[in-house]
Interface confidence: medium
């Protein structure tokens, strides 16, 4: 015998309360597939979350984060506070990267500068809190009298080209 619920399309549910007829999902709920016996509650983008896509009867709402925060987790399940470049988020808030580490984004942790010597290279540009070192040719390749280290380049937003 065919399940009467299998006829219920997305946006409806097979309603126990009405002898298993297909009823539309109530407001603020959805069913993304047919044959569902219940609709799911729409996600609410509240507080630091903001609505990227409204909920419809057939699809859930999608959230992202308000300015000053960024998404974490599958489907932006959490919003985490942004820090400045050169900082990382700790339990006590945004803290500057320790010497020898950098963070070139508004999120994530401070990471150690690259150890150029592991690759047999020299430091071409010193690291900063916001930037990794730039490794250059090996010391043997440098011409006599040339300075081996350049001061750090001014920090800039990742993905932007220099002015």
């Amino acid at each position: 015998l065919q399940d009467p619920c299998s006829n219920c399309p997305a946006g409806t549910f097979c309603d126990n309360n009405r002898n298993q007829i297909c009823s539309p999902c109530p407001p603020n709920s959805f069913s993304s597939a047919g044959g569902q016996r219940t609709c799911d509650i729409c996600r609410q983008c509240k507080g630091v979350f903001r609505t990227r896509k409204e909920c419809s009867s057939t699809s859930n709402a999608e959230c992202d984060c308000t300015p000053g925060f960024h998404c974490l987790g599958a489907g932006c399940s959490m919003c985490e506070q942004d820090c400045k470049q050169g900082q990382e988020l700790t339990k006590k808030g945004c803290k500057d990267c320790c010497f020898g580490t950098f963070n070139d984004q508004k999120r994530g942790i401070c990471r150690p500068w690259t150890n150029c010597s592991l690759d047999g290279k020299s430091v071409l540009v010193n690291g900063t809190k916001e930037r990794d070192v730039v490794c250059g040719p090996s010391p043997a390749d440098l011409s006599p009298g040339a300075s081996s280290v350049t001061p750090p380049a001014p920090a800039r937003e990742p993905g932007h080209s220099p002015q």
Epitope: N16, N17, R18, C25, P26, P27, N28, S29, R37, T38, C39, D40, I41
Partner: antibody
Framework: QVQLVQSGAEVKKPGASVKVSCKAS????????INWVKQAPGQGLEWIGN????????NYNQKFKDKATITADKSTSTAYMELSSLRSEDTAVYYC????????????WGQGTTVTVSS | DIQMTQSPSSLSASVGDRVTITCRPS??????LNWYQQKPDKTVKLLIY???RLRSGVPSRFSGSGSGTDFTFTISSLQPEDIATYFC?????????FGQGTKLEIK
């Protein structure tokens, strides 16, 4: 916010009837089922029945079929449950609660109405 | 009607303890299992719906799991404000039925 406010406590004599009201606010009254639940003193919860205010479609627990009548007034966003031929075993707290919209769960709940049947 | 067997009927635990309540329906109810909290002042709140989904605004120390005929409700770290009676409820089949409740007290 979504709220259900029930009428006050009632004391009735055996054989009488009582009508408990449940006023809804903060949402579209006609779009969600209203359920009624009984809790006798020191006991658990029992589902009595429900109503869909848009078309007054009702379901009843067979146990309460001859005891309870559930109605709704769309114009005032109020659901009612009338209990007839009252007996001492009808003494209980009666709750109205809205369908949450998923998995046949109930939220929010009214504050409850105490009905005491005593001669 | 589907019978809901909830256990234990009462329990006493200390603040910070992990608390577990079980609910066993008399027949398979898929995931149509919901959990409620009734405070001593008789106010009732939905905590978890569809076995494991936390209602918006409910603290994450509450969780649920299971399927079919075996369900569990857990409070990961008991807080003083969790003193209440907890009920399970099946939404699979009319008439909807509740467990008998678990009264939770603080030691």
């Amino acid at each position: 916010q979504v709220q259900l406010v029930q009428s006050g406590a009632e004391v009735k004599k055996p054989g009488a009837s009582v009508k408990v009201s449940c006023k809804a606010s903060g949402y579209t009254f006609t779009s969600y089922w209203i359920n009624w639940v009984k809790q006798a003193p020191g006991q658990g919860l029992e589902w009595i029945g429900n109503i869909y205010p848009s078309d007054s479609y009702t379901n009843y627990n067979q146990k309460f079929k001859d005891k309870a009548t559930i109605t709704a007034d769309k114009s005032t966003s109020t659901a009612y449950m009338e209990l007839s031929s009252l007996r001492s075993e009808d003494t209980a707290v009666y709750y109205c609660t809205r369908d949450y919209g998923s998995a046949y769960s109930f939220h929010p709940w009214g504050q409850g109405t105490t009905v005491t049947v005593s001669s | 009607d589907i019978q809901m067997t909830q256990s234990p009927s009462s329990l006493s635990a200390s603040v910070g303890d992990r608390v577990t309540i079980t609910c066993r329906p008399s027949q398979d109810i898929s995931n149509y299992l919901n959990w409620y909290q009734q405070k001593p002042d008789k106010t009732v709140k939905l905590l978890i719906y569809y076995t494991s989904r936390l209602r918006s605004g409910v603290p994450s120390r509450f969780s649920g799991s299971g399927s079919g005929t075996d369900f569990t409700f857990t409070i990961s770290s008991l807080q003083p404000e969790d003193i209440a009676t907890y009920f399970c409820q099946q939404g699979d089949t009319l008439p909807y039925t509740f467990g008998q409740g678990t009264k939770l007290e603080i030691k």
